[in-house]
């Protein structure tokens, strides 16, 4: 089977979404979890994980093959305490599969905005934290 | 067994906005996607959306997007729809039904005792 | 969107007797097609699943078949019990939907 681990961000106001994202066919989600980390570059695990979430088993239609299963970890306001290095990671339990997601960072700036680099879909988003645009 | 527990009929003025509620019990909640149902008397049924309660994923017919909300608290195993600027055709009787796993069962296994909502002045 | 056309719109029957009901679909579902029994002041229960699979506690009488586009629902020597309204719906592809639903009333 062929499992896809991607990771996105998106801003509602000062809200700051974090995503993850897995496509993946119904007879692999079986014990499988997908989380989000924090500064955790070697022992990334649904434990130190600051949100986890199982995989769908069903993608609530008949006429599909894949199913995505979405964990999104929402940070209200965005401080310097949440600048950091992030990953999305997912793990099987019955096969012992792990999947990394790409690193993407947090950097909260001196002028009270933050960036976030790395993201795969786009390769740079910057926010303004006051004013709550997408620049 | 499985149940689905659906809030008492509602009253409710045009313009107005209500939420009702659908306890689920005797099965994972989170596993299972919840559908959302408007049965207008004497009529058939129409199928609002659904959600499923383990990622928040929430599925809707062109219709009544903008019009219905669907939530789920997973620590209540409660799934609730949101109406909003309510009107005289949003009078119906609402369902809540749970989706069968795919490929096992697939159609809607349980179904709530329905709750009707009446909109008027 | 999939438009599933069900007919007769009623169905008048003696008892005793047996029917078929038919469910179109405005595109192939494969066997993805569901029906529901509703009478009046009741919540609809699940008959058939996936157009021709038995469901546990609904009398061997009733059955269904169909794949693609054109499904029936028939049922062997109706009773009195089984007057009421019944529903297709499909679950092949978003937004899930019903057909508009047979009524089966005593003749």
């Known amino acids: 089977g062929c499992i896809n681990i991607t990771s996105s961000a998106s801003q509602e106001g000062t809200r700051l979404n974090l995503i993850c994202t897995v496509w993946h066919k119904k007879e692999e989600a079986e014990g499988f979890v997908v989380f989000l980390c924090k500064d955790r570059s070697g022992d990334c695990s649904p434990e130190t994980s600051l949100k986890q979430l199982r995989l769908k088993r069903d993608p609530g239609i008949d006429g599909v093959g894949e199913i995505s299963s979405q964990l999104m970890f929402t940070i209200s306001q965005v401080t310097p305490l949440h600048s950091g290095t992030y990953q999305c990671c997912a793990r099987s339990q019955k096969s012992g599969i792990r999947l990394q997601g790409h690193f993407f960072s947090i950097l909260f700036t001196e002028t009270g905005n933050y960036t976030v680099t790395g993201l795969k879909q786009r390769q740079h988003l910057e926010f303004s934290h006051n004013e709550g645009t997408l620049s | 067994q499985v149940h689905l527990q659906q809030s008492g009929a509602e009253l409710a003025r045009p313009g107005a906005s209500v939420k009702l509620s659908c306890k689920a019990s005797g099965y994972t909640f989170t596993d299972y996607w919840m559908q959302w149902i408007k049965q207008r008397p004497g009529q058939g049924l129409e199928w609002i959306g659904s959600?499923?309660?383990?990622?928040?994923?929430?599925r809707y017919t062109q219709k009544f997007r903008g019009k219905a909300t669907l939530t789920a608290d997973k620590s209540s195993s409660t799934a609730y729809m949101q109406l909003s600027s309510l009107a005289s055709e949003d009078s119906a009787v609402y369902y809540c039904a749970r989706r069968g796993i795919a490929a096992v069962v697939g159609g809607f296994d349980y179904w709530g005792q329905g709750t009707t909502l009446t909109v008027s002045s | 969107d999939i438009v599933l056309t069900q007919s007769p719109a009623t169905l008048s029957v003696t008892p005793g007797n047996s029917v078929s009901l038919s469910c179109r679909a405005s595109?192939?579902?494969?066997?993805?097609l569901h029906w529901y029994q509703q009478k009046s002041h009741e919540s609809p229960r699940l008959l058939i699943k996936y157009a021709s699979q038995s469901i546990s506690g609904i009398p061997s009488r009733f059955s269904g078949s169909g794949s693609g586009t054109d499904f029936t629902l028939s049922i062997n020597s109706v009773e009195t019990e089984d007057f009421g309204m019944y529903f297709c719906q499909q679950s092949n592809s978003w937004p899930l939907t019903f057909g508009a639903g047979t009524k089966l009333e005593l003749k």
């Open positions: 959600i499923y309660p383990g990622d928040d994923d929430a």
């Open positions: 595109q192939s579902i494969s066997n993805h």
